[in-house]
Interface confidence: low
């Protein structure tokens, strides 16, 4: 609905009368709408609504409001809807950032690895190498490393120590032996909540050149692997967005691991046992899978001398 | 048995407009997205148009864009395509098709895959 | 958009006979490439996705493979039902590009 006048505005726009080429200084029209009809000498200016789709931030002394930014584009997710105070804004949405005008799922730390820094819509999971002490026993983009287990606190022993990617192994000892392996019988004790129900192995993926049976499953969400590791890197001179096909070039031990959650199918990228052979560590050199989803569209800034 | 089956097809002129249903049963249609795909006489395949499991994302192709409007209405199971404006170069079996699986919709990102399930496509032809 | 280009266009071969069809991407698209079959009248038929795995109920003689931009797809051994179009299609961004078609034809 058209306005005469609003109150509480303070700000005013020179305009000049096209009819009489006289300068003349008219009230702004309130944010969310724009000037319909300039201030005469007889008369007020008249403010109209933005019409959908449109908005102004501002006060302002406009004869039509900004258009707002096309839609978010896949698989980027509105932050803010067009209204008529705010453009639209484009988020990338849970699990996923901001990289290179598209949205890339957070990194996927593998077993061994923890979360250091947790991932935003802006930035990257950070992942570290789990310190002494501590292990990672599934790979995730939001789990840290875990304490070993105190054995004993529960007045067990360690039966098998933890490394980096498995928790210690409590056990009893019998009184009569003075083993370190359990005997027949003996109750180990592992700790049962580090098992992540939602991720259960299914089926494996093998890379080419690998033998394997091909999974069936359908599609499944691609994340990457180890693309922002902070601790015990390599210096990364590799490409930043590297295919399926580099992946395999340059970790050749790589498996994915089909895990199923409920409906959802996603691959995790995960380093086998046998990279440790070339020196006790897991090859640390980042990794990104191939950016899916669509650039942001530049969303246009708007300047005008009549507004703000 | 996991079923497509489109209808709605038919001669029309040029300018003119129509709207092809697909119904589906056999899945939980709410669960997927879907696409619109269409194959003109003698020719290939041609990327129509593509609507998430809510329906509240959209996607069009170039030479339809602005003319045609993907929607479903998944408490009837169906997917929808309305063609405004409609040109010779239209003519052409409209196929619906289920995309392999897009559970991950309800994570607020998607990706696509191939299309695992087909209708046997309705003939649309624009003709004076 | 991303142009699908397969070749041969055509192809007559016998049944027993090993197939070769080649998909060429006009920018790379990683791993994301699905092959379809069909056949006159009838609507396509996914036979591989993600370019090398296998859609469930494919016979296991067809197979995939390639990345970045070149992609091929083999049938070994050429049943009398495999005859008919074959579409490679990038699933890598939207609009979703097929390529041209290859026809195997029975020699």
């Known amino acids: 609905q058209p306005e005469q006048k609003a109150s509480n505005l303070i700000g005013t726009y020179r305009h000049v009368d096209r009819a009489t080429g006289q300068v003349l200084t008219c009230d702004k029209c309130p944010a969310g709408t724009y000037v319909s009809e300039h201030c005469t000498n007889t008369s007020l200016r008249v403010c109209s609504s933005c019409p959908v789709g449109t908005f102004t931030r501002h006060e302002n002394g406009i004869e039509k409001c900004h258009d707002c930014s096309q839609p978010c584009p896949w698989p980027m997710i509105e932050k803010l809807p067009c209204a008529a105070l705010t453009d639209r804004e484009c988020t990338c949405p849970p699990g996923m950032f901001q990289s290179n005008a598209t949205c890339a799922p957070h990194t996927v730390c593998p077993v061994g690895w923890g979360v250091r820094k947790k991932g935003t819509e802006t930035e990257d999971v950070r992942c570290k190498q789990c310190a002494r002490g501590t292990f990672s026993d599934v790979p995730s983009s939001v789990m840290k490393c875990k304490a070993y287990t105190d054995c004993l606190s529960q007045n067990l022993v360690v039966i098998k120590p933890g490394t980096k990617e498995t928790d210690n192994v409590c056990g009893t000892l019998p009184s009569f032996s003075s083993s370190t392996s359990p005997s027949p019988g003996t109750a180990i004790f592992p700790r049962p909540e580090h098992m992540e129900t939602h991720e259960v192995p299914s089926s494996t993926y093998v890379p080419k050149g690998m033998n394997s049976t091909e999974s069936n499953s359908s599609a499944s969400v691609r994340p990457k692997v180890l693309s922002s590791i902070q601790e015990g890197t390599v210096p990364d001179n590799t490409s930043s967005a590297r295919g399926k096909e580099d992946v395999n070039k340059t970790l050749p031990n790589l498996q994915v691991v089909n895990h199923q959650q409920g409906p959802h199918h996603r691959h995790i990228l995960k380093l086998l046992p046998s990279m440790e052979a070339t020196g006790g560590e897991k090859s640390s050199t980042p990794i990104k899978g191939p950016k899916r989803g669509h650039p942001r569209q530049n969303l246009h800034k708007h300047f005008d001398i009549n507004e703000h | 048995e996991v079923q497509l089956l489109e209808s709605g097809g038919g001669l029309v002129q040029p300018g003119g407009s129509l709207r092809l249903s697909c119904a589906a049963s056999g899945f939980t249609f709410s669960r997927y997205s879907m696409q619109w795909v269409r194959q003109a006489p003698g020719k290939g395949l041609e990327w129509v148009s593509v609507i998430s499991p809510s329906g509240g994302s959209t996607m069009y192709a170039d030479s339809v864009k602005g003319r045609f409007t993907i929607s479903r209405d998944n408490s009837k199971n169906t997917l929808y395509l309305q063609m405004n404006s409609l040109r010779a170069e239209d003519t052409a079996v409209y196929y619906c098709?289920?995309?392999?699986?897009?559970?991950?919709?309800?994570?607020?990102?998607?990706?696509?895959?191939?299309?695992?399930?087909w209708g046997q496509g309705t003939t649309v032809t624009v003709s004076s | 958009d991303i142009q699908m280009t397969q070749s041969p266009a055509s192809l007559s071969a016998s049944v027993g006979d090993r197939v070769t069809i080649t998909c060429r991407a006009s920018?790379?698209?990683?791993?994301?490439l699905n092959w379809y079959q069909q056949t006159p009248g009838k609507a396509p038929n996914l036979l591989i996705y993600?370019?090398?795995r296998l859609q469930s109920g494919v016979p296991s003689r067809f197979s995939g493979s390639g990345s970045g931009t070149d992609f091929t797809l083999s049938i070994s051994g050429l049943q009398p039902e495999d005859f008919g179009t074959y579409y490679c299609q990038q699933s890598y961004t939207i609009p979703l590009t097929f390529g041209g078609g290859t026809k195997v034809e029975i020699k």
């Open positions: 993600d370019a090398s």
């Open positions: 920018q790379t698209i990683a791993g994301y």
């Open positions: 098709a289920r995309e392999s699986y897009s559970s991950s919709w309800y994570s607020g990102y998607y990706y696509y895959y191939g299309m695992d399930v």
